[in-house]
Interface confidence: medium
């Protein structure tokens, strides 16, 4: 048998940070050690989410927002809300199920994550390539091999090498 | 002896709700959080949540958020998982486990037959 | 999640064999917190090893367990019968990040 409700659950008065409390009457109680509610109305505290392991706090757990976690040096994000932990690779590697691996011939990554990519093929737009593709960059592609003038060449050599973690715009 | 006494099998029709419980004893109830995990069909292992039987605070699986509801009752030891608006994918074997830390489960209940069926 | 492959999905051993199954997570998993449980067939799971190596009260020494980062084992030095079972790895990552392997079910020839 439930008792019927006033109009107005008492409940709804209860701030975020306090869930209200059955046991005391439906009084607002403020949340306990290591948990949260990040809305009012709430009857129970959410445990607060816990960095463990691989993952570090970047946000401390406050009455009434959840902790926020990113990972250790050496590990970059993956997931909504930075589920997952995933170990960096170097720029011209790609991570596989036995580790960092270079990049194919013909692929790079100018990243610490994600997969090789294929170099752009730049007859496919009808240009010439113009720097010769790397491990770690993309090819560029230069003009149409018609808008060279006679005897230019196609291919020039490499550029020099960036400082590592310098991504081309 | 430690012992974790789950309620007994459930047969229920889809869009229902059931409410299932593990009762503890031979140990302080309020001292070890309790798990939840379900398993179906004889598959793997699914953690749904946990609950604070100190604090009632919980934190649950982003997959059974609005599934699942835990409550406890102090006075008797018992943990609470309510389940809603039922379908067949939630017929499954549902295991009530103590946590002594916050990760692994050292205790299981015996687990309750749960069947969703018109 | 941090999904977690166990491999093989099932295996045979005669019993005196020496076995291992694997265990290999997504990402990254600190070592104290990857566990492992036996389940028999109708029975509930029991915590079997926990944070990695360590053999929880009453599992037989014949069995140990060793890995880190994403790739985990457990051995069995010389199968008995009584090992007949599915082998579910477990990893944390703090609430609410906790997942299962699919298992690996042991069987004796």
């Known amino acids: 048998f439930e008792r019927t409700r006033s109009l107005q659950d008492p409940c709804s008065n209860c701030p975020a940070g306090t869930f209200c409390d059955n046991n005391r009457n439906q009084i607002c109680s403020p949340c306990p050690p290591n948990s949260f509610s990040s809305a009012g109305g709430q009857r129970t505290c959410d445990i607060c989410r816990q960095c463990k392991g691989v993952f570090r706090t970047r946000k401390e757990c406050s009455s009434t927002s959840n902790a926020e976690c990113d990972c250790t040096p050496g590990f970059h994000c993956l997931g909504a809300g930075c589920s997952m932990c995933e170990q960096d690779c170097k720029q011209g590697q790609e991570l596989t199920k036995k580790g960092c691996k270079d990049c194919c011939f013909g692929t790079f990554n100018d990243q610490k994550r994600g997969i090789c990519r294929p170099w752009t093929n730049c007859s496919l737009d009808g240009k010439s390539v113009l720097v010769n593709g790397t491990k770690e960059r993309d090819v560029v592609c230069g003009p149409s091999p018609a808008d060279l003038s006679p005897g230019a060449s196609s291919v020039t050599p490499p550029a020099p090498a960036r400082e590592p973690g310098h991504s081309p715009q | 002896e430690f012992q974790l006494q789950q309620s007994g099998p459930e047969l229920v029709k889809p869009g229902a709700s059931v409410k299932i419980s593990c009762k503890a004893s031979?140990?302080?109830?309020?001292?070890?959080?309790m798990n939840w995990v379900k398993q179906s069909n004889g598959k793997s292992l699914e953690w749904i949540g946990v609950?604070?039987?100190?604090?009632?605070?919980?934190s649950y699986n982003q997959k059974f958020k609005g599934k699942a509801t835990f409550t406890v009752d102090q006075s008797s030891s018992t943990a609470y998982m309510q389940l809603n608006s039922l379908t067949s994918e939630d017929s499954a074997v549902y295991y009530c486990?103590?946590?002594?830390?916050?990760?692994?489960?050292?205790?299981w209940g015996q687990g309750t037959t749960l069947t969703v069926s018109s | 999640e941090n999904v977690l492959t166990q491999s093989p999905a099932i295996m045979s051993a005669s019993p005196g064999e020496k076995v291992t199954m694997t265990c290999r997570a997504r990402?990254?998993?600190?070592?104290?917190?990857l566990h492992w449980y036996q389940q028999k067939s109708g029975a509930s799971p029991k915590l079997w090893i926990y944070?990695?190596?360590n053999l929880a009260s009453g599992v037989p020494a014949r069995f140990s367990g060793s890995g880190s980062g994403t790739s985990y084992s457990l051995t069995i030095s010389s199968v008995e019968a009584e090992d007949a079972a599915t082998y579910y790895c477990?990893?944390?990552?703090?609430?609410?990040?906790?997942?299962f392997g699919a298992g690996t079910k042991l069987e004796l020839k």
């Open positions: 477990q990893q944390y990552s703090g609430y609410p990040l906790i997942t």
């Open positions: 486990a103590r946590s002594p830390v916050e990760d692994y489960f050292d205790y």
């Open positions: 944070s990695t190596s």
């Open positions: 990402s990254s998993v600190s070592s104290s917190y």
């Open positions: 609950i604070n039987p100190n604090y009632g605070t919980t």
């Open positions: 031979g140990y302080s109830f309020t001292d070890y959080n």
